[in-house]
Interface confidence: medium
């Protein structure tokens, strides 16, 4: 599925995948455990989460967010560097908050260009766009502080504690769900 | 009350244009998340796009990415699908509906019926 | 071909219990993404019956209910009635397509008498 968020791949170079297995679709295999992987999405040209099985599958498996993006995304790593040695901050840092079309509620983070800060937001599991952190340490790390130097103090404890409701949200019906993948 | 009114459907040649229009009503329109769905005459349903509240995030089914383009109109309550490139295949009921739910379309419009032929 | 697979009719008398089921893949509904049903009424546009697998918005009476249970989905309908005689479509987001958002090839209910 398409997804266009003013989301330019020029930081990110070309969106062919850095190795054939990337293109493989998640594959969760035969047996039933229930273990929170990552995979990387051709159609999206995301790193997403997915729950695999336990046994068998493919390459196209990750344990952390973080090693499916330096996988699989192209000039990832670069970017990363980057960022941390106080170039500027990646395109996608600016992209608005996107929870997806679905209904899963994960706590994520993402850059806030207006208040220049990483801030909680929910995710809800499936589209979106990749200003999507899984934590807010690598949010900071790669868009709200590119140029290294520590974070820490006040503010952090009490960004992980905001949550709101934002567009993805039960408007209508209040109910909470929460999906595993 | 919400409501969802569609319009812009009519008879176009193959290779045609045409802009559907969806007014809505009766919700605050900008925080919510739509999409159009279409059905085929005596056919199943069919997702075609969606756009976020704020219209920053857009999304296409394959079979009409490139061709047709999503947008709105916060400040006119208007949801619309630029329809380029018209196949014999696009001819249906083109729904729009509001992701109340987010995956779920909470509320839908009447339809307007665009019909592809030379 | 629909990625979700519905039974394409059935026919039950008032009174009796009906289930439409709705077959899914480890990439949609054995992946933990919600189902949601709709019904759509002769001449109509669909109105949504479920949401998030088995609830029911405000107004759509109890008679409706879901469940999934790992890649399947069903719609239950108690207490069959004239007015029930309809398309069902079950719907859910499937992260190995392109089209992600998909729904069954739909179900049409006959009441029967």
């Known amino acids: 599925l398409s997804e266009e968020a003013d989301d330019t791949d020029s930081e990110l170079g070309s969106m062919k995948p850095l190795h054939t297995f990337c293109a493989m679709k998640a594959d969760d295999g035969p047996c039933k455990a229930m273990i929170r992987s990552y995979f990387f999405n051709m159609y999206t040209h995301q790193c997403e989460e997915f729950i695999y099985g336990g046994c068998e599958g493919n390459e196209n498996r990750f344990d952390t967010l973080e090693e499916c993006k330096k996988t699989c995304i192209p000039g990832y790593e670069k970017t990363a560097v980057k960022a941390a040695s106080g170039a500027e901050r990646p395109d996608f840092c600016f992209l608005e908050e996107d929870p997806g079309l679905c209904r899963g509620y994960m706590k994520r983070y993402l850059y806030n260009n207006q208040t220049k800060q990483c801030e909680r937001f929910v995710y809800g599991g499936c589209l979106g766009n990749r200003n999507n952190f899984e934590t807010l340490d690598e949010c900071k790390k790669i868009c709200e502080n590119p140029g290294g130097g520590s974070g820490g103090g006040l503010n952090d404890i009490f960004e992980a504690q905001k949550i709101e409701w934002h567009e993805g949200g039960p408007p209508h019906h209040h109910h909470h769900h929460h999906h595993h993948h | 009350e919400v409501q969802l009114v569609e319009s812009g459907g009519g008879l176009v040649q193959p290779g045609g244009s045409l802009r559907l229009s969806c007014a809505a009503s009766g919700f605050t329109f900008s925080s919510y998340a739509m999409s159009w769905v279409r059905q085929a005459p005596g056919k199943g349903l069919e997702w075609v796009s969606a756009?976020?509240?704020?219209?920053?995030?857009?999304y296409y089914a394959d079979s009409v990415k490139g061709r047709f383009t999503i947008s709105r109109d916060n400040s006119k309550n208007t949801l619309y699908l630029q329809m380029n490139s018209l196949r014999a295949e696009d001819t249906a009921v083109y729904y729009c509906?509001?992701?109340?739910?987010?995956?779920?379309?909470?509320?839908w419009g009447q339809g307007t019926l665009v019909t592809v032929s030379s | 071909q629909s990625v979700l697979t519905q039974p394409p009719s059935l026919s039950g008398a008032p009174g009796q219990r009906v289930t439409i089921s709705c077959t899914g893949s480890s990439s949609n509904l054995g992946a933990d993404y919600d189902v949601q049903w709709y019904q759509q009424l002769p001449g109509t546009a669909p109105k949504l019956l479920i949401f998030?697998?088995?609830n029911r918005p405000s107004g759509v009476p109890d008679r409706f209910s879901g469940s999934r249970s790992g890649t399947s989905a069903s719609l239950a309908i108690t207490g069959l009635q004239a007015e029930d005689e309809a398309n069902y479509y079950c719907q859910s987001y499937d992260r190995s397509l392109s089209g992600s958002m998909v729904f069954g090839g739909g179900t049409k209910l006959t009441v029967l008498g």
């Open positions: 509906a509001n992701n109340g739910a987010a995956a779920a379309w909470d509320y």
């Open positions: 756009i976020s509240g704020s219209g920053g995030s857009t």
């Open positions: 998030g697998n088995n």
